[in-house]
Amino acid sequence: RPSFSLVEDTTLEPEEPPTKYQISQPEVYVAAPGESLEVRCLLKDAAVISWTKDGVHLGPNNRTVLIGEYLQIKGATPRDSGLYACTASRTVDSETWYFMVNVTDAISSGDDEDDTDGAEDFVSENSNNKRAPYWTNTEKMEKRLHAVPAANTVKFRCPAGGNPMPTMRWLKNGKEFKQEHRIGGYKVRNQHWSLIMESVVPSDKGNYTCVVENEYGSINHTYHLDVVERSPHRPILQAGLPANASTVVGGDVEFVCKVYSDAQPHIQWIKHVEKNGSKYGPDGLPYLKVLKHSGINSSNAEVLALFNVTEADAGEYICKVSNYIGQANQSAWLTVLPKQQAPGREKEITASPDYLE
């Protein structure tokens, strides 16, 4: 049963999907494996707070501590990465704040910025001093656990020396790692003692061992790769938007709704209205009117602009966003003041939100 009655037939035109969605990211909290993470639920007046991770209820356990508005994760692991939400349940409504947790090793992002110093890793020995292989830069090998988002590039390094110059080969899960073992293969840069895998996928998860050897000995080092995936999810609305606003009669005002969605989002701006002097229909549900929605004839649906407002425009404005997975909505109040009273903006409203691709 829908939770409102529409005042008029709001049959929507078919949508013209954009080539890319205008999205803004939820806040991201990054932690290295083994670290502890504390996040405060950024919602006000919360009587009861409940937590979810990737849509599943999150309860306390030996590593997860929930105290009031705080979530603590002790000894974070890549499995803790995901989309988190805290929901504040109040007597009249509930509000949800979303954030991402990424337990990842930044070194494994695959940037080659540290490859410029590769020459120091390639140590030439005096030909008379025969020497078994040894590590030349153990600092670059300290992080054994690499948690990387899917589609990123991963680089593992084993800088070594020895005389004669050792050779390097790579194993995956203890077996010879062949090019055909992954789509797109991989690169080995012997100069830099590195293994590079581009656009990692879940099947790349596992243990990667570099074996460095010459005729005088062999050394090895193992890295563990975890590929962190994210499933598609319902839209996320940036906390605090739309923001409450006030203006004088005859003034103009804008409400902004910042949307983050994996899939085509459908945006509606809805207002509580009266019909025949009543705010509620015979079924007890409030009357709502769709003021604007995304579609062919709607530009910049994330912004609702009201011009030359009257006192009748005062009230609650709801930004409701849905995709095939689910929906989310947040609202703001418009206060309309008499002309002689100067408006006190409760929050600055920006007409052009910053969107991240």
Epitope: P2, P17, T19, S231, P232, R234, A263, Q264, S322, G326
Partner: antibody, heavy 114, light 107 residues
């Protein structure tokens, strides 16, 4: 783990109605749409519609308006589809699926027969 | 309604072969396309979402590509257990529509 449980089969008479259930567990029921999909040998897969259990919002395929009614009960985490004025054309397997289509029920086989 | 035209309707392949199935949308759907595997007596299984993202636990021999109106689903190294009907679906605009399906048979 996430599960959607549906009854295995329903046999109904032409002209009658049938109401099928889809009980969800392992996730927060109110935060995902529940989709309903029809499968017939001739027609392949057809999306009937979806419901957002948190507020009861529904979206229907026009082809099923008047034929299918979607409801949800938050207290039992169960979604329902009611099919009315049944004919042999309605004999099919009806699946429910979570909003992301990553989890599906086993399907209910509806047979319309005298 | 957006029509998803899937081809071919059926194909017979040998183990180890590479299979490609195409899906053409009657209007642009950005990258809002999913691919499913449907085996007899089983529910559909999500393989690919958002055109190219492999769902959790799906083997990497399954890949998807494309955007706008033209989409391709590929099985790079067909296995005997891949015998099934494969469907594309657009989830951009309601009603969410499926392609007619491609039946993959193993020689």
């Amino acid at each position: 783990q996430v599960q959607l449980q549906q009854p295995g089969a329903e046999v109904v008479k032409p002209g009658a109605s049938v109401k099928m259930s889809c009980k969800a567990s392992g996730y927060i029921f109110t935060t995902y749409n529940v989709h309903w999909v029809k499968q017939t040998p001739g027609q392949g897969l057809e999306w009937i519609g979806s419901i957002y259990p948190d507020n009861g919002d529904t979206s229907y395929n026009q082809n099923f308006k008047g034929k299918a009614t979607l409801t949800a009960d938050k207290s039992s985490s169960t979604a329902y589809i009611q099919l009315s004025s049944l004919t042999s054309e309605d004999s099919a397997v009806y699946y429910c699926a979570r909003g992301d289509f990553a989890y599906w029920g086993q399907g209910t086989l509806v047979t319309v027969s005298v | 309604n957006i029509v998803m035209t899937q081809s071919p309707k059926s194909m017979s392949m040998s183990v180890g072969d590479r299979v490609s199935i195409t899906c053409k949308a009657s209007q642009g759907v950005s990258n809002d396309v999913a691919w499913y595997q449907k085996k007899p007596g089983q529910s559909p299984k999500l393989l690919i979402y958002s055109a190219s993202y492999r769902y959790t636990g799906v083997p990497d021999r399954f890949t998807g590509s494309g955007s706008g109106t033209d989409f391709t689903f590929t099985i790079s190294n067909v296995q005997a257990e891949d015998l099934a009907v494969y469907y594309c679906q657009q989830h951009s605009t309601t009603p969410y529509t499926f392609g007619g399906g491609t039946k993959l048979e193993i020689k």
